[in-house]
Amino acid sequence: DPASKSRSCGEVRQIYGAKGFSLSDVPQAEISGEHLRICPQGYTCCTSEMEENLANRSHAELETALRDSSRVLQAMLATQLRSFDDHFQHLLNDSERTLQATFPGAFGELYTQNARAFRDLYSELRLYYRGANLHLEETLAEFWARLLERLFKQLHPQLLLPDDYLDCLGKQAEALRPFGEAPRELRLRATRAFVAARSFVQGLGVASDVVRKVAQVPLGPECSRAVMKLVYCAHCLGVPGARPCPDYCRNVLKGCLANQADLDAEWRNLLDSMVLITDKFWGTSGVESVIGSVHTWLAEAINALQDNRDTLTAKVIQGCGNPKVNPQGPGPEEKRRRGKLAPRERPPSGTLEKLVSEAKAQLRDVQDFWISLPGTLCSEKMALSTASDDRCWNGMARGRYLPEVMGDGLANQINNPEVEVDITKPDMTIRQQIMQLKIMTNRLRSAYNGNDVDFQDASDDGSGSGSGDGCLDDLCSRKVSRKSSSSRTPLTHALPGLSEQEGQKTS
């Protein structure tokens, strides 16, 4: 129809100008469209320069929409991480404060002379929780060994106890069980509780990290062309009122976000494992019960040592020989009264239950984040047509969209009619993030069984790759032991984004 050839470009001028582009580019009326490289080559209101500007703009708008969606998810994960971290740190800090307040009165010099050893233990526990590559069982064993040496010397000031005698004492210690059942109980419970707490918080950190890194993956040129066609070609072709057909939009975005959808399986596995590990937060070996009650095990241990002092001394002398008596030394230390114990089971505060139920709900809500992303962006950002009728924009004209909707993920885009996707070239950043999810899931599964995956001889994640940028200070490289200097693989992730809490000045 010759009349339609000279249609005015007023509506396009308005839209183009509103986007901040110069109106001098816009023709007054439609022109022939042989110059168009993305949009169908009918009569058009777009010059080559306009087409290029709108293509760049549509690309940027999709990246912004993608980042916005990711930011919401990241913010949720960061809030969860902060809440749980605050709670776990609070439990440990509370325990240490209780120890500092009650032990001087309960144990006198047996505590004050060893305050540094107790402070160090809490620092080590804090570091372990925050992702330092230290062996918790070894750290606890070393604490008890050092404490035994010091307390034995204090309880026997009348004896000369040179280093070689103390070395012998250390070798006898395991058989003598000087602190009763407390060290074993604390080791079993603390290992399970701290492993569960730290792996859960690490899981939140890794999930957040993955979302952040994936949001930075650039969209390829084929995607840019398809999005331009989806969003702005209708304007160029003189049907600015036509909204994209829903299935057309889904195919474009499934093609654009094919690699992202491949995160789905491992993302679900990670979130499932995180929900599962929260079961370990309850009961007598649960996080709240154990982390908040470290001081009660320590009190029990010192009481046991005092109660067993005479038997212990006899056995040590039997194994290590008679130590020399210091002629000017005082008599043996008076037996102190037993330190009063707080009840071992902390009554649950309700805070953790609330945190866990919120976390479970939110983690379930975002389980299908990656595969629902195309649909979400289409419905929230693309001003879709309300129905798949013949009045929507199908990429060529106003009309019905006939192709079927593609499946999710890279492999399913082989016949995507809207985006040319090379299914043989997966995005490497996203593959690395899939590996990070796998490693973290493996860590959570081990933690569920009470094992610290970083200190198992045969780590089955098979990979040391990954960003590793979650490490604080030099936590990930450090080993703590004066008896051994192991060289196990450092953590791939410590806890990202947590505040420094060690290395504080004290006087």
Epitope: P162, P330, V480, E502
Partner: antibody
Framework: QVQLVQSGAEVKKPGASVKVSCKAS????????MHWVRQAPGQGLEWMGE????????TYNQKFKARVTMTRDTSTSTVYMELSSLRSEDTAVYYC????????????WGQGTLVTVSS | EIVMTQSPSSLSASVGDRVTISCRTS??????LNWYQQKPGKAPKLLIY???NLKTGVPSRFSGSGSGTSFTLTISSLQPDDFATYYC?????????FGQGTKVEIK
């Protein structure tokens, strides 16, 4: 065998800062506290503070608390002592010293670092 | 802080002499007292820890005794290598403190 090797002598102006290093070898670095002790010319020994190389926790002598910072780098088994707002009376030999076992007894000493503060 | 007082501040003695150095503390430190030897231009060396334990490798002519607030370092037969300054130090509490030193000179 245990060795503590300190950085070389320094000459500083009043008001400046100095950072002395102490590289440890021959034992598990994170297993023992490290202390800093100084000795002014012709004077006695003065304890400045300690650091736990495992955790980075520090305890300072109140006298130096506002001016001293002790840090460690576990990757190089090195501890550092930084003293700021130097004055002429800070001219001294600064020693790092490692504990014998967990006991506050200084069994191993660095060779010392002479810091001279002069305008 | 615990104040450490050594006496004498210096002494002159001959090879073969028996030498005793005293260290007193401003409060009880039980047996947490250590002795160091320092030669000019060198770092101190640990001799005795926990009041009376001889560090491995230190000659047996050195001995230590005492408890509470009063301690003694004894060199049973002074040797040429023993002319140096000796310091006591408490490891009972923080801040760690040293005595002012006792210089042992050749008579």
């Amino acid at each position: 065998q245990v060795q503590l090797v300190q950085s070389g002598a320094e000459v500083k102006k009043p008001g400046a800062s100095v950072k002395v290093s102490c590289k440890a070898s021959g034992y598990t670095f994170t297993g023992y506290y490290m202390h800093w002790v100084r000795q002014a010319p012709g004077q006695g020994l003065e304890w400045m503070g300690e650091i736990n190389p495992s955790t980075g926790d520090t305890t300072y002598n109140q006298k130096f608390k506002a001016r001293v910072t002790m840090t460690r780098d576990t990757s190089t088994s090195t501890v550092y002592m930084e003293l700021s707002s130097l004055r002429s009376e800070d001219t001294a030999v600064y020693y790092c010293a490692r504990e014998k076992r967990d006991d506050g007894v200084f069994a191993y000493w660095g060779q010392g670092t002479l810091v001279t503060v002069s305008s | 802080e615990i104040v450490m007082t050594q006496s004498p501040s210096s002494l002159s003695a001959s090879v073969g002499d028996r030498v005793t150095i005293s260290c007193r503390t401003s409060q009880t430190i039980r047996h947490y007292l250590n002795w160091y030897q320092q030669k000019p231009g060198k770092a101190p060396k640990l001799l005795i820890y926990d009041a009376s334990n001889l560090k491995t490798g230190v000659p047996s002519r050195f001995s230590g005794s005492g408890s509470g607030t009063s301690f003694t370092l004894t060199i049973s037969s002074l040797q040429p290598d023993d002319f140096a300054t000796y310091y006591c130090q408490q490891s009972y509490s923080t801040p760690r403190t040293f005595g002012q030193g006792t210089k042992v000179e050749i008579k």
